[in-house]
Interface confidence: low
């Protein structure tokens, strides 16, 4: 399908002008190639009428032009002094007329209505309010005032000053007679319907002395605003319906093939399941305006959308609406990234978030989509640090790999972490994307102690076990803070091929803190990565306590807590289960015994990639 998009139908009246906007993917080639507007003939050929290269056909001379806006990926065709002969089928496109990079546009120019002299024309959108002004002479001030609608040769009474109201206008019309001295009465019609369209007659008095005034009411369906967005990107519909419906329920719906409108989301809590996790209806402002954001755009999201207000939260005739025609461009600049990321309880996920690479300095955010009410997305973390304290020790946003992608790591997963998350920046809003985290059955691949207590001034060694499938990955330990995870200096142990054979004895990367200081308290992550792409992580909390006096029940020397599946021969350490710790204080009894060996010349913190045997433990 062609990526060029424009209005399918354009209608106007003789003598008027039209402006037709066509959209195209703003690639370098497209921005500079020829743009054209051509008319389809009976033979199927499309004859150029105006192009971006300056050509204007004789029929369009002096009344048409084509302007390219390469920075927006749009071009606009303006045609003035329309005649009935301009009605027909056209194409707006790029390149050569016959190439198919085009969009079909139907233009209909109709004859303007023949109106009686002195007719006042009122042009109002459906659902809105019109006030028809009816002047009268002093002698008719005390006499009956009325508004009629002309239908063919007959006039049907709509409302009069004797309290008559035509049933078709019940509860939405009023006739106002001003105070003395004002020689004008008004008729106000609310919630206009398409059927209200037509010629009306104001009348004051009767007989040959009566005052009459014609009013032509044109009730228009709102012209849909064209919206051109990239596949996988995001769209925002801003809906401003006016103060008169500020306190009425709002909705966004999508027109279906039967020309009815299916609710996408409304303020009464209804939401189409196809938009689960990727839609927000932002709380409305005092003036009743609101906006709906949809992320993770799919080709099937294309179509005509209406927003409106009605107490039922769905489309009803005679209530104000706004319209959009959404086109989803498959030649997207937004890269593919997983829309579902799976993790196991106790394990971790690393989520890749795309952003506009031209905006590398923009602030990056990650939020959790909540479906309650109209949907909202509390920020969890941003590129300058953690936002939500309950994610302390298990959530980090990294600028890597960069160049249009950042990474979010969440570990110590529980079933409560399942859900939809949004990647955001404070820059280009069209790059908002959605990812779903699913928690599946399984065991974490990286195994670390549940939590450890280190003794001040002594040496601490924390093991992290990994399976053979990670043998070619880079292993690291880092210290978590609410502004990131600072990688700890690594101490090479032996040749870099240490893990090539991946036998039972070469699956351990350990962290050494020597000597332990108060500042060492906190969360530590063990992780694997390939270049700038992060894999799994496991977290452990290190508490620091004073050295125990003689008689302490802690035995030394020993190493840190064993990994969950590891039996330890040292007397001071017991086998522990793998826990996803969120509050280390809950596990204060689970101590790790520090090595009291000679610390002279030892490094403050180091990471060892070595075998279990070298650590003095044994593997199962």
């Amino acid at each position: 399908k062609s990526p060029v998009f424009g209005p399918q139908e354009v209608s106007s009246v003789e003598g008027n002008s039209v402006s037709i906007k066509c959209y195209y993917p703003p690639t370098s080639v497209n921005r500079h190639t020829r743009k054209y507007w051509c008319r389809k003939g009976a033979s199927g050929r499309c004859i150029t009428l105006v192009s971006s290269e300056g050509y204007v056909s004789s029929n369009y001379a002096g009344r048409a032009n084509l302007t390219n806006f390469p920075e927006n990926g749009t071009f606009v065709v303006n045609i003035a002094q329309l005649s009935r002969d301009d009605s027909g089928h056209y194409k707006c496109g790029l390149g050569i007329n016959s190439r198919g990079l085009s969009f079909d546009v139907s233009l209909e120019v109709s004859q303007g209505p023949e109106l009686p002299n002195g007719t006042e024309v009122y042009t109002v959108d459906v659902g809105r309010t019109v006030t028809i002004k009816c002047p009268f002479k002093t002698e008719n001030a005390p006499k009956t005032k009325a508004l009629y609608k002309k239908i063919g040769q007959t006039s049907v009474l709509v409302i009069d000053s004797r309290n008559y109201v035509n049933p078709n206008y019940k509860d939405r019309i009023r006739l106002r007679i001003p105070g003395t001295g004002q020689l004008i009465f008004t008729v106000v019609i609310d919630r206009l319907r398409l059927s209200d369209h037509g010629l009306y007659l104001c009348q004051a008095g009767d007989g040959s002395n009566r005052d009459e005034k014609n009013a032509d009411l044109q009730v228009l369906e709102p012209e849909p605003e064209l919206v051109y967005e990239d596949l996988r990107g995001s769209v925002t519909f801003h809906c401003a319906l006016g103060l008169e419906v500020a306190n009425v329920a709002k909705f966004l719906c999508r027109v279906n093939s039967r020309e009815t409108c299916d609710v996408v989301i409304n303020t009464l809590g209804k939401r189409d399941s196809a938009f689960e996790g990727r839609i927000l209806l932002n709380p409305q402002d005092k003036d009743g305006s609101f906006s709906v954001v949809i992320t993770g755009l799919r080709k099937e999201d294309e179509g005509r959308y209406l927003c409106g207000a009605h107490s039922d939260g769905q489309l009803q005739e005679g209530w104000p609406i706004q319209a959009w025609q959404l086109f989803v461009n498959e030649e997207s600049t937004i890269p593919r990234s997983p829309t579902v990321v799976k993790g196991v309880a106790g394990g971790s996920v690393a989520v890749l978030c795309p952003y506009n690479p031209k905006e590398s300095q923009s602030l990056k955010y990650w939020c959790l989509w909540e479906g309650a009410q109209n949907g909202r997305c509390p920020l969890l973390v941003e590129s300058q640090g953690l936002v939500q304290e309950q994610y302390e020790g298990r959530l980090s946003l990294l600028q890597e790999p960069g160049n249009g992608t950042f990474t979010v790591i969440l570990n110590q997963l529980t079933t409560q972490d399942a859900g939809f998350y949004w990647c955001l920046t404070n820059g280009d809003t069209r790059w908002r994307t959605t990812v779903e985290i699913k928690i599946i059955e399984g065991e974490p691949n990286l195994k670390v102690p549940g939590n450890v207590t280190a003794v001040l001034g002594e040496t601490l060694n924390i093991p992290c076990h990994f399976p053979c499938k990670f043998s070619s990955y880079e292993k690291y330990w880092c210290k978590w803070s609410n502004t990131g995870c600072q990688t700890l200096p690594s101490q090479d142990e032996g040749p870099s091929e240490a893990f090539v054979n991946c036998d039972e004895n070469s699956r351990l990367v350990s962290l050494t803190l020597n000597p332990v200081t108060r500042a060492d308290e906190g969360w530590y992550w063990c992780g694997v990565k390939q270049g700038h792409f992060y894999g799994e992580t496991a977290a452990v909390y290190v508490a620091v306590e004073e050295k125990k006096v003689a008689g302490s029940r802690y035995v030394s020397p020993a190493k840190a807590d064993a990994a969950p599946d590891e039996k330890v021969l040292d007397s001071g350490v017991r086998e522990i289960e793998n826990k996803a710790i969120q509050d280390p204080r809950l596990f204060a009894e689970e101590k790790v015994v520090a090595d009291t060996g000679d610390q002279a010349g030892g490094s403050r913190a180091s990471v060892d990639s070595s075998s279990s045997e070298e650590q003095g433990g044994s593997s199962k």
């Epitope: 932002n282 609101f290 939020c367 997305c377 936002v387 949004w422």
Partner: nanobody, 124 residues
């Protein structure tokens, strides 16, 4: 969580001006939508103004449009409310609020962080 402290309130004559400040501590507020609300004696707390993260988008209650201006200085972690042409009906306790919600519009329910308030009295 962010802590917010308002200042700049006081007694002023009708037609006069005041500038309220809201200083944030505990974390940077450059990711927060910030707002001002007010509560007159015996009335509900009402929206006055809001400003987005970057300061590029602002909204005002109809009753203060054209008279009040909200602004922010992310470097100073501070939000301001410049109040001109004050009227007696502007008398209220003014509260500064912050929202970490990703939301284009915000009602008072969407603000998670609140200051203690500063009293503005406009005499006729």
């Amino acid at each position: 969580e962010v802590q917010l402290v308002e200042s700049g309130g006081g007694l002023v004559q009708a037609g006069g001006s005041l500038r309220l400040s809201c200083a944030a501590s505990g974390r940077t507020i450059n990711t927060y939508v910030m707002g001002w609300f007010r509560q007159a004696p015996g009335k509900e707390r009402e929206f006055v103004a809001r400003i987005d993260w970057s300061g590029s988008s602002t909204d005002y209650a109809d009753s203060v449009k054209g008279r009040f201006t909200i602004s922010r200085d992310n470097a100073k972690n501070t939000v301001y409310l410049q109040m001109n042409s004050l009227k007696p009906e502007d008398t209220a306790v003014y509260y500064c609020a912050g929202s970490a919600y990703y939301s284009g519009y915000v009602t008072h329910r969407d603000f998670g962080s609140w200051g203690q308030g500063t009293l503005v009295t406009v005499s006729s």
